[in-house]
Amino acid sequence: EVEKTACPSGKKAREIDESLIFYKKWELEACVDAALLATQMDRVNAIPFTYEQLDVLKHKLDELYPQGYPESVIQHLGYLFLKMSPEDIRKWNVTSLETLKALLEVNKGHEMSPQVATLIDRFVKGRGQLDKDTLDTLTAFYPGYLCSLSPEELSSVPPSSIWAVRPQDLDTCDPRQLDVLYPKARLAFQNMNGSEYFVKIQSFLGGAPTEDLKALSQQNVSMDLATFMKLRTDAVLPLTVAEVQKLLGPHVEGLKAEERHRPVRDWILRQRQDDLDTLGLGLQG
């Protein structure tokens, strides 16, 4: 903590400007009024303060707002956000998407830090649900964001938000997460016609039950092997050879290359050899 010392004559800051970079830490502490800093936070990012100087500025804000910063200050924190701890952020009440975007921009290009994770958690909890605009914003900055949520957290995603989800946002989701997301996607896309529906639902099919896969097999969807490999084992096992052939269409030949991998291996094992032979792929049950 910076020692309390009187501000030297003529050094009292009238505004936040470039001259402050020449101030020693104790001078910043003594000569910069916290209330002035709070009202001119937007200027801080344009000034090349050292990390040590930023520590002083943070300390001044902490003293002014012991219960947590107001959103008017948070929105303009800029690089000072990187100095915040998760404990600091837990005191905040962030409601504006613009504030969230401004802070995510500071961390752009880096992995999600504990600070960012706490910020997002506070924001989403404040909103009560993960709405479409928020999801759009978060997945733009962190494509893996959705798959970092627990199944319980995903249950707060309204079906309307599913429209914001891109296939790459689901790349790292596990079966438990897709089990939650699939019914929401099914609901969100229910009014689309066959081929359009399949394009949209395809990324979510890792959560689909057997009945839905059987229904898709009747619609000439030509599912690719990459999608088939992501299906739930328990959903695939009851499918007949004829149903899998219809589901995959021309991609059925790809089963041979995946015969040693799950869930293809599990499915092959449970089929009658006579039925497998009809595929002409040399699959051994």
Partner: antibody, heavy 119, light 107 residues
């Protein structure tokens, strides 16, 4: 509740064939979702999967043991068996039989049987 | 075959500690990785399946995460009964393989 019990000789001579049987109780070896595996653990070492069988008779073996391993199933007795030929001292281990549920993993294990290869 | 490399091979920890064990697959195992606990003289016990699903009857202090090649088993607050050896295992490829094991000992 499904239980597994290994049985067989505890001592086998080098170059002979090791034979073990696993008896399934409280459930059926003919279950649709399950495969039945043999796994071994040499003293003080880690686990090594040997192979599995499905009730239809389809098998899948560890490539490093494939030439010496035969796993068979007897649905009428609710048993499956392991034969490992041309054994050496390196085959000395605790041998476990285990059920693998396709949706989970090796969720049920026998208590294991120690087999020593020595003359 | 897919090789499973576990680390550390052993660790010392105290009751109440948070313990993390990692397992790296030599090629993608998708999410088909399971975790087992084994105590001396006993058969292994399934803790986590499909990378992150908790096996029925297993305490919630155990959790798993990961996909592709990197997997983690976490014990949030180590209990006296948790001192044991832990193994990861992949079942994505038909040739199942186990990690070398991690022995968790009392500090």
């Amino acid at each position: 509740q499904v239980q597994l019990q290994e049985s067989g000789p505890g001592l086998v001579k080098p170059s002979e064939t090791l034979s073990l049987t696993c008896t399934v109780s409280g459930g059926s070896v003919s279950s649709f979702t399950d495969t039945w595996s043999w796994i071994r653990q040499p003293p003080g070492k880690g686990l090594e999967w040997i192979g599995y069988i499905y009730y239809s008779g389809s098998t899948n073996y560890n490539p490093s043991l494939k030439s010496r391993v035969t796993i068979s199933v007897d649905t009428s007795k609710n048993q499956f068996s392991l034969k490992l030929s041309s054994v050496t001292a390196a085959d000395t281990a605790v041998y476990y039989c285990a059920r693998e549920d396709a949706l989970t993993g090796f969720d049920i294990w026998g208590q294991g049987t120690m087999v020593t290869v020595s003359s | 075959d897919i090789q499973m490399t576990q680390s550390p091979s052993s660790l010392s920890a105290s009751v109440g500690d948070r313990v993390t064990i990692t397992c790296r697959a030599s090629q993608s195992s998708r999410y088909y990785v399971n975790w087992y606990q084994q105590k001396p003289g006993k058969a292994p016990k399934l803790l986590i399946y499909a990378a992150s699903s908790l096996q029925s009857g297993v305490p919630s202090r155990f959790s798993g995460s990961g996909s592709g090649t990197d997997f983690t088993l976490t014990i949030s607050s180590l209990q006296p009964e948790d001192f044991a050896t832990y193994y990861c295992q992949q079942s994505y490829d038909a040739s199942y393989t186990f990690g070398g094991g991690t022995k968790v000992e009392i500090k």
